[in-house]
């Protein structure tokens, strides 16, 4: 039940009013109206939406709605000399090139500006050579091919398939590979659902569409030519040649069509197994180089775009509180895409702008909020969450001291299976309370709360009759402040079923067929599954803005951490015969970790018995639950990614949308067998784990009573 | 012309220890695996394991994991197969034979050694 | 591992006749399946390989064909020296592989 107080609408009603009056019918003209045109970061197209954003969010009632400009670094492919790759004969000639646009879908053939498939920030370049194929290009993919197989993709072109993990890590391994570009492409394993047509009449993917998207590995520094400050007037701007997280090959993507041509001719070694095949025609052979009668044949990369520093522009919308307008809850999500952006993003889009629209009917009647919520319409979340990092680094200072909570809204759904949520350990209980007052819309399931089909449908794999909350990794614009700045973030969307539908994201993912056609003829015609959306992420932004006490629950977290323990022990456990060479041990880590827990109790005892008539021991109690999460940041970061500060969390280093716990440990354990200098390695181990000692107890501390 | 000469057949005892070996000529020989494989008099072909001259990387089919050692010494272009203790049934012959690729079939072979274990 | 079974253990055909030998797998290995011919005191011989490539010098009234689980060597028009036998190989699980237990080929 909401814990919310009344301002001017009684209490019980103050939740159930905002929820009633988010309709299914405005998400649909929403995303209707944002999903005409393409609107790329720096076009005029996405300025004019942000403009009109601003105009309606002022309708709607929101206090005050500012742009905030910044001139960060994006990437355009060159208008006049087109990106491809051809197959080269022994002469030099081009006995075939792959396609330069994706043919458009019905009805959108005259809309001008669609961006041709490329992978924003490639440098530009004329690579020729033999091919190998890499597999998804993850780590272990390259550590099969090269240290187990013996093959050497130094100098070569290596061409990967899309999916698994995020495609700058692929880039990453593949210039450490020592490879001289990188072709991307889906593969319909990954891409096409089995007995499902392709788009227009399914949600699959064609074999002529291709997923665009950026190749960067900034590791959370926003703008590579800014990082740590705002890309405003007066920054002082990088070289290029300093920028951060700009990849050193070229790299292009391509459909399933265009593939098939090149990987019919591989030859050399055949891939190590069958987890490394496809569903295309081809052998799926290793290379290098074509085979027997096509040995003579070349591939060769002609990629021409452009990066150059370009305007953007955020939304800023503000909702006043009513008691604490200095405690700030966020709800922000991009506006940019990269054609139409059906589901990516303006299905979250939609659903923020009828969050907005529905606070801001009971603005009018004369309700506020407790605390301020600030809402967030976020550019260039394509090119790099470069939007939302500019904004944060300008408004660090007070975001630190005043940032309660940020919900992230980019898609509303993924699938229309089942909830998906990522979040704060201290989100956990809001969340499960929240989705059991919330009514399931799957089929099935009527009358039922989402939180019963939720859990019937993603099991948690711990705890029995709980459903699954992930770690938040990267990836999206919640990384900043969660990251960086220790901001309590969660996320929620619906989703695919994972068990049967293994393909990597959607099928259409970032390619001109995501329309608002797919969106109301395929995923979800009468506006449901996103309307629940709606309804998670505003419901959440609700209690995190009005209730008296903060919904978080640091009790969760001490059950996380413990658990996070004994996985990165089992890890080091591995190497029983290092740790005791190095004297390598956990005890202070577990210690920490048995303080916090029982510190978390007793907080929680107190929380619960206080005397919430007296405002200044209210504020100081929801002071210590606000900046629990930011007492997890280690100023200093993690080594050689000093914007990723967060000791518990942080994207994987070998894939950015997955979060790793304990990463400071984890990385240094990573491949430790491997290292030159084993006694340097396992002390860069202890290293880790005094630091992660000393945040867990240093967070505990900050549970304790305050004198 | 890549070639590979094994040395020549070998009479022994059981409990007895044995090295034979394998030549290559013709090619790069730290460029590309070797495998040996057993034939057993009137039997068919069992892979037994791979060795990658260039650094002496080797993997073992399960069957013979620590019932034979292969080794490289990439310096005279040579991979050996070696037993320490040898049974009656290891009486057979064995070939050596190159990868084509890392993973890919045997594009050449030796001309086998026979081994025969006798007491 | 990948189970291989060869089928007939033996093969009984007349020269200039079509000879057709089998090669089934346990699981599927895509293309990944050699064929070689072993005569009476010699090493074994590539023949084929990504289940129908010829290696150089072979003639061509050897062939190979299949994907995936069904794999079949054929010799259009045969002749006496063809008279061997036929070994199938998967290299699809690396560093594993694995032989068929053969099919003998006797010209009548």
């Known amino acids: 039940k909401s814990s919310s107080e009344a301002t001017n609408i009684t209490p019980k009603h103050n939740m159930k009013a905002f929820l009633d009056e988010l309709k299914a019918e405005n998400i649909k003209k929403f995303l209707h109206n944002f999903t005409q045109i393409p609107h790329l970061a720096g076009t005029e197209q996405n300025f004019q939406l942000a403009k009109q954003i601003q105009s309606q969010w002022k309708e709607f009632g929101l206090d005050s709605v500012e742009l905030t400009h910044y001139d960060v670094l994006l990437s355009y492919p060159n208008k006049t000399h087109p990106n491809y790759i051809s197959i080269i004969n022994e002469d030099g000639n081009e006995i075939f090139n792959t396609s330069l646009f994706e043919p458009p879908p019905a009805g959108y053939e005259n809309v001008s500006d669609i961006v041709p498939p490329f992978s924003a920030f490639s440098p530009q370049g004329m690579p020729e050579g033999d091919l190998v194929y890499v597999n998804y290009a993850r780590t272990e993919d390259f550590f099969k091919l090269e240290r187990d197989m013996k093959i050497n993709c130094s100098g070569k072109i290596v061409i990967a398939r899309y999916g698994k993990v995020f495609r700058g890590n692929k880039v990453k391994n593949a210039q450490l590979a020592g490879a001289t570009g990188v072709i991307l492409y889906s593969d319909p394993a990954d891409y096409f659902a089995p007995g499902v047509k392709s788009y227009p009449d399914g949600w699959n993917l064609p074999g002529g569409g291709v997923q665009r998207g950026n190749i960067l590995n900034l590791n959370g520094a926003g703008d590579p030519l800014t990082p740590g400050y705002p890309a405003n007037e007066y920054a002082y701007r990088r070289g290029m040649a300093e920028a951060v997280g700009l990849p050193s090959i070229p790299v292009h993507p391509i459909g399933y069509y265009d593939a098939q041509k090149l990987l019919e001719k591989m030859g050399g070694s055949a891939s190590p197994d069958s987890s490394w095949r496809g569903s295309l025609k081809v052998p799926y052979n290793v290379g290098p180089g074509f085979t027997g009668n096509f040995s003579t044949q070349k591939v060769k990369m002609h990629i021409h775009s452009t990066s150059e520093v370009t305007r953007i522009y955020n939304v800023i919308g503000t909702l006043r509180g009513a008691v604490e307008p200095d405690r700030y809850v966020i709800l922000g999500g991009h506006r940019d895409s990269w054609v139409f952006g059906g589901i990516d993003p303006q299905s979250g889009a939609a659903v923020v702008h009828e969050i907005v629209r529905s606070f801001g009917t009971l603005k009018k009647e004369g309700w506020r909020p407790r605390r301020t919520i600030l809402f967030a319409s976020w550019d260039a979340e394509e090119f790099g969450l470069l939007g939302s990092t500019e904004w944060a680094e300008e408004n660090s200072r007070l975001l630190q001291e005043r940032g309660v909570a940020y919900i992230n809204a980019d898609s509303s759904i993924e699938g229309n299976y089942t909830l998906r949520v990522d979040c704060t350990p201290l989100m956990y209980s809001l969340v499960y309370n929240l989705t059991k007052e919330l009514e399931s819309p799957d089929e099935g399931f009527e009358g039922k709360s989402l939180y019963e089909s939720w859990t019937k449908k993603s099991p948690s794999p711990e705890f029995s009759g709980m459903p699954r909350i992930s770690k938040l990794g990267s990836g999206n614009d919640f990384e900043v402040f969660f990251q960086r700045l220790g901001i309590a973030s969660g996320r929620a969307r619906y989703t695919k079923n994972w068990e049967t539908n293994k393909f990597s994201s959607y099928p259409l993912y970032h390619s001109v067929y995501e329309t608002y056609e797919l969106v109301e003829k395929f995923y979800d015609p009468m506006f449901k599954y996103h309307l629940t959306v709606a309804q998670v992420r505003g419901g959440m932004v609700f209690e995190l803005a009005n209730s008296v006490v903060l919904p978080f629950d640091c009790r969760d977290y001490a059950v996380v951490l413990r658990k996070y323990a004994d996985k990165i022990y089992n890890i080091s456990m591995k190497h029983p015969q290092e740790m005791k060479t190095y004297s390598v041990s956990f005890d202070s880590l577990f210690s920490a970790v048995k303080n916090f827990t029982e510190i978390a109790s007793k907080f929680s005892e107190r929380l619960r018995d206080f005397d919430k008539s007296n405002p200044i021991l209210l504020r100081m109690m929801n002071d210590q639950l606000m900046f629990l999460e930011r007492a997890f940041i280690d100023p200093l970061g993690l080594p050689d990614r000093p914007f990723y500060r967060h000791v518990i969390y942080a994207p994987s280093s070998h894939n950015k949308y997955a979060g790793e716990s304990f990463p400071g440990i984890y990385d240094a354990l990573f491949d430790i067998e491997s290292k030159v200098d084993p006694s340097q390695a396992w002390g860069e181990v202890k290293r880790q784990i005094s630091v992660a000692t000393f945040t867990v107890q240093a967070a505990a501390e900050t549970l304790s009573e305050v004198a | 012309e890549v070639q590979l000469v094994q040395s020549g057949a070998e009479v022994k005892k059981p409990g007895e220890s044995l090295k034979i070996s394998c030549k290559g000529s013709g090619y790069s020989f730290t460029s590309y695996w070797i495998g040996w494989v057993r034939q057993m008099p009137g039997k068919g072909l069992e892979w037994m394991g791979i060795i990658y001259p260039g650094d002496s990387d080797t993997r073992y089919s399960p069957s013979f994991q620590g019932q034979v050692t292969i080794s490289a010494d990439k310096s005279i272009s040579t991979a050996y197969l070696q037993w320490s203790s040898l049974k009656a049934s290891d009486t057979a012959m064995y070939y050596c034979?190159?990868?084509?690729?890392?993973?890919?079939?045997?594009?050449?072979w030796g001309q086998g050694t026979l081994v025969t274990v006798s007491s | 591992g990948i189970v291989m079974t060869q089928s007939p253990a033996t093969l009984s055909v007349s020269p200039g006749e079509r000879a057709t030998l089998s090669c089934r797998t346990s699981q599927s290995i895509g293309w990944n399946l050699a064929w070689y011919q072993q005569k009476p005191g010699q090493a074994p011989r590539l023949l084929i390989y990504?289940?129908?490539s010829r290696t150089t010098g072979i003639p061509a009234r050897f062939s190979g064909s299949g994907s995936g689980t069904e794999f079949t060597l054929t010799i259009s028009s045969l002749q006496s020296e063809d008279s061997a036998v036929y070994y199938c190989?998967?290299?699809?699980?690396?560093?594993?592989?694995?032989f068929g237990q053969g099919t003998e080929l006797e010209i009548k």
């Open positions: 990504g289940a129908s």
């Open positions: 190989q998967h290299y699809d699980n690396w560093p594993m592989c694995s």
């Open positions: 034979a190159r990868r084509m690729a890392a993973a890919g079939p045997f594009d050449y």
